[in-house]
Amino acid sequence: QTSVSPSKVILPRGGSVLVTCSTSCDQPKLLGIETPLPKKELLLPGNNRKVYELSNVQEDSQPMCYSNCPDGQSTAKTFLTVYWTPERVELAPLPSWQPVGKNLTLRCQVEGGAPRANLTVVLLRGEKELKREPAVGEPAEVTTTVLVRRDHHGANFSCRTELDLRPQGLELFENTSAPYQLQTFVLPATPPQLVSPRVLEVDTQGTVVCSLDGLFPVSEAQVHLALGDQRLNPTVTYGNDSFSAKASVSVTAEDEGTQRLTCAVILGNQSQETLQTVTIYSFPAPNVILTKPEVSEGTEVTVKCEAHPRAKVTLNGVPAQPLGPRAQLLLKATPEDNGRSFSCSATLEVAGQLIHKNQTRELRVLYGPRLDERDCPGNWTWPENSQQTPMCQAWGNPLPELKCLKDGTFPLPIGESVTVTRDLEGTYLCRARSTQGEVTRKVTVNVLSPRYE
């Protein structure tokens, strides 16, 4: 009778084991072991027992002890089970961002590991088990589906293998994959709201505001604002689940025409975009041209108004005839026209909006000087010793210089308060002088003496 010890061994891959082959007869003709494994016999006293060291055991094996005794030949097998933890435990790659409400399939691949009967694959979210299955196939694959929730944001998913050799008197060997950190997001189906001027004048600045509600996590949202090829640099303000991006936009003559204003919101691996057209226009103020801004009374003056070729103008409230970008009027300059404003209003239609521009010019009419009865009375009668203010106003443009002299030397204090004396009596010659000429007027002052009783 042949016996083997141990009859069952579990050992690590590449390990060694001592196997004892024994026989019940004292003088066996033969006693040995049959195995493809490298073996070394350890010398022992006696003939009915042999010990072999079997080394570099790479896979399960069944070495067989045999003996040949007088009563016949017999054999006994020992069962060597090799254990080793998996070579690779990996979660199949996934995009790190996943939309809330989507089904996410987690797939764990396990390469190798033995004995497979003791190998289990566990899918985890954090420390919570999602699925546990025995490892089957090469590679062993375990999958589970997770409905992505908002509160999964930042959660770590992993895959663990458990080689449980505790029933064989060994330990529980665990291997864990690199974690997959889930980033969940909500990007609403509604496009962002874009508020901007529909028209924008060359060499001016406009403000563009792009906003969107219902985002999660809002801090991770990227906002791209652009006008044509010009990237705008917005200031972004965040709310709980909303943002508002505000940017200044400057346009130049090169931008003239219809431009696309875009606001794109990127969150996770999705984006929402709003497009709007902005018309960039050039519309200089109309030009008011006077033949001469300063003319003498009686001169013929032409007032012209010229504007953008597509504009329609009115000059002093009178539309151009025919309606168009030019208007003019003719007048003979009178003193009343001095300081008169000529206002040209131009209207241009840009992208359905009416844009108004005004320009005003003032006409200066040179006239005078003038001295008339109303403003410079020819006769004053004042009681002696009374307080009086002689008034004489000369008119003209430019304003004339006025002097009133008696006998060519004694001045009348125009506009000053004086005490009336006898000396004040007499005829004065008032002379008004300007670059436009000179006029004179006689003014008589009578002084009434009080009656003494």
Partner: antibody, heavy 120, light 112 residues
Amino acid sequence: QVQLVQSGAEVKKPGASVKISCKGSGYTFTDYALHWVRQAPGQRLEWMGVISTYSGNTDYNQKFRGRATITVDTSASTAYMELSSLRSEDTAVYYCARSLYFGSSGFDYWGQGTALTVSS
Amino acid sequence: DVVLTQTPLSSPVTLGQPASISCRSSQTLVYRNGNTYLHWYLQRAGQPPRLLIYKVSNRFSGVPDRFSGSGAGTDFTLKISRVEAEDVGVYFCSQNTHFPYTFGGGTKLEIK
């Protein structure tokens, strides 16, 4: 004992296709993946692709993707490698080899090889 | 693709003497789990390759202990402590760390 037995030598014309088989025995067929490796004269060994004999999943070397197709018949414990649009450069000895799916412990057992000659 | 360069191309050795073959990789062969998937094969004339060493230094079943592997990162060595007649053939290194898997160009071991 573990054995991988491949089909016999093939001679093909350029543009044709060839299908080589590899039958596994002496082990649980679905416990290991099967890889295909070729050796052209004077060239280094070239890994072509792998199949999971359990699930049928495959991975290919980009160089052969679209031209090589690896399949498995578990009931016959046999894997197949079909190479289409053959050209003279495909003249080589084609081997199947047993291993883990990602080959982490090396290709422990190999078939005897199938010689393919592509000539007009 | 990862290129494995073997040196020497040919190595004439006296029986009973040691032999050494080098394999250098164009990039590190350390996988993200810390393991290094570099293997050695021997191909005798007219036969398929045979696995000798897996994962740098682990002898495969039935491989004599005169064969040993060492190295790390990008530099690896196969040593035969005492060459025997049956060791004649072409030795290949191979990597299964990066996709696609690649082989070295081979080193021919011959007896002087």
